[in-house]
């Protein structure tokens, strides 16, 4: 009996179609496949950023797998042909490994690329990203913000810089379609007549970085002889109610009585009728259902009750 | 359907460069290697580069080696090969082919002439 | 370099009759093999690949095999379509190499 072997695919490379950080890993069949035409041949691709301590493992039919990476860093991949049992009469067949590697070839010290970038997704709706230029730059040094998500056929430019002495430290997006829940890829290079700028990469989803407005039209109403209900509106905007978690804090004569987290517009409070002073605010943030995370939004205005017996009626500012 | 158009005809001097082109349309380009094959007047075929799809790994036999660079942009899908210090026995019809997923080639350009000649 | 040596050199048939080319390789080339036709003035025409596996569209009396270093090319019943020169191809190792060609015409 023969041992029955199997190449490894050919041709195995990382191609960068210019997403920032979007990458095709792409193969060619083995040579001499055509021995298990009846037979359906898969590949196990392995692949990560190199310092990682994890591989992600793919097993596919096809010649091509797609996936955001960090090009901050280099990549590493490796792929083999295996033989499914029932191509063999017996045990899987593997080929040996090919491996192939990625990354971008950095210019500048590190030092030259933008420090404390930020971006924030306000109310759902505006995206803002904002940088402090490198340390030690000059003044002629600019950065340029490009940015990609699928749906886009190509990497975009900002067009809205917002600028301080004359450099970009800032962009503010225009209206981003269908931009929610994927990947969105940002490169902030740069450029100066003195030294070469290193390029900074960042990935996050929007959802995950949305600020909402805080919460409006707040209002007491007493529900029973110890109890108050604190009630708001959700805050304007294209958020659902199902997104929100709230957070109240809540002073009762000028002492701080109750912080809570609560899922819906209302807080039940028990009170004494020695109360003569109620202030509550509320803040909002997306929550678990919605996203993975989120960022507080500012606190609402106060809303008071003060001066008369919170017994007597429904209090509302 | 696939097809391949290439550039004309080039009539080059000894020893000068020139740079061929071709224009794929009717595949996804950037999913399948490319190459180049001559065939000089009254000749057999002699196969000349082989470029991957992505364009990270390319092919050469000796007697082209050092001297023609096969590129290509997939942002275009255009496939090149620039030819420098040209001999006279470069002298020949230059097709681009598309390599299949077996490294066969399985769709042909209609061919560009390159004359060499002093 | 692996050489793949092609005959005959001409092949004179008559219309109908079946042929058959062959190609050896100088080594081992397992089923790495591809033919191409080509009519005069045109480029060249993808035929098989695998030694023995038509492309789509090369009528099925075009049949190859072989696996190694022999090969052939058979045609069943030769048209007046099919005058062209034949190569063989090996894709087994770089440098790809190409047989020498087989001319086929009409007596």
């Known amino acids: 009996d023969t041992e029955i072997k199997v190449n490894p695919p050919q041709d195995f490379e990382i191609v960068d179609p210019g997403y920032l950080g979007y990458l095709y890993l792409q193969w060619q069949p083995p040579l001499s496949l055509d021995h298990f035409k009846e037979c359906t041949v898969e590949y196990e691709l392995k692949y990560r950023n190199i310092g990682s301590e994890t591989w992600k493992t793919i097993i596919t039919k096809n010649l091509h797998y797609k996936d955001g990476f960090d090009l901050n860093k280099g990549i590493e991949a490796k792929i083999h042909t295996l033989l499914p049992w029932q191509c063999t009469n017996g045990s899987e067949v593997q080929s040996s490994w090919a491996e192939t590697t990625y990354w971008i070839s950095p210019q500048g010290i590190p030092e030259t690329k933008v420090q404390d970038m930020d971006c924030v997704y306000y109310n759902w709706q505006y995206l803002l990203c904002s940088w402090k230029p490198g340390i030690g730059v000059l003044l002629d040094t600019n950065y340029n913000l490009f940015y990609w998500y699928e749906g886009l056929d190509h990497a975009l430019q900002c067009v809205d810089y917002i600028k301080a002495d004359g450099q970009n430290i800032g962009c503010r997006f225009p209206y981003l379609e269908a931009s929610d829940y994927k990947d969105f890829y940002i490169c902030v290079n740069g450029s100066s007549e003195n030294k070469p700028i290193r390029s900074s990469y960042f990935t996050f989803q929007l959802q995950n970085i949305v600020k909402p407005l805080p919460p409006v039209y707040l209002t007491f109403t007493r529900e029973s002889s110890c109890e108050i209900k604190l009630k708001w509106s959700i805050p304007l905007g294209p958020i659902p109610a199902r997104c929100f978690d709230y957070e109240i804090e809540i002073r009762e004569d000028d002492t701080t009585l109750v912080t809570a987290t609560v899922e819906n517009e209302t807080y039940t409070l028990k009170t004494t009728n020695e109360t003569r002073q109620l202030c509550f605010v509320v803040r909002s943030k997306v929550n678990i259902y919605c996203s993975d995370d989120g960022i507080w939004s500012e606190w609402s205005d106060k809303q008071c009750w003060e001066g008369e017996d919170l017994s007597k009626k429904t209090l509302l500012r | 359907q696939v097809q391949l158009v290439q550039s004309g005809a080039e009539v080059v001097k000894p020893g000068a460069s020139v740079k061929l082109s071709c224009k794929a349309s009717?595949?996804?380009?950037?999913?399948?290697?490319m190459s180049w094959v001559r065939q000089a007047p009254g000749q057999g075929l002699e196969w000349v580069a082989t470029?991957?799809?992505?364009?990270?790994?390319?092919y050469y036999p000796e007697s082209v080696k050092g001297r023609f660079t096969i590129t290509r942009d997939n942002s275009t899908s255009t496939l090149y090969m620039e030819m420098r210090s040209l001999r006279s026995d470069d002298t020949a019809v230059y097709y681009c082919a598309r390599r299949d997923l077996r490294s066969a080639m399985d769709y042909w350009g209609q061919g560009t002439l390159v004359t060499v000649s002093s | 370099d692996i050489v793949m040596t092609q005959s005959p050199l001409s092949l004179p048939t008559t219309l109908g009759q079946p042929v058959s080319v062959s190609c050896k390789a100088s080594?081992?080339?397992?089923?790495?093999v591809a033919w191409y036709q080509q009519r005069p003035g045109q480029s060249p025409r993808a035929l098989i690949y695998s030694a023995s596996y038509r492309y789509s569209g090369v009528p099925d009396r075009f049949s190859g095999s072989g696996s190694g270093t022999d090969f052939t090319l058979t045609i069943s019943r030769v048209e007046a379509e099919d005058v062209a020169v034949f190569f063989c191809q090996q894709y087994n190792a770089y440098p790809l190499t190409f047989g020498g060609g087989t001319k086929l015409e009409i007596k």
């Open positions: 080594q081992n080339v397992d089923i790495n």
């Open positions: 009717g595949f996804t380009f950037s999913s399948y290697g």
């Open positions: 470029i991957s799809g992505g364009g990270s790994y390319t």
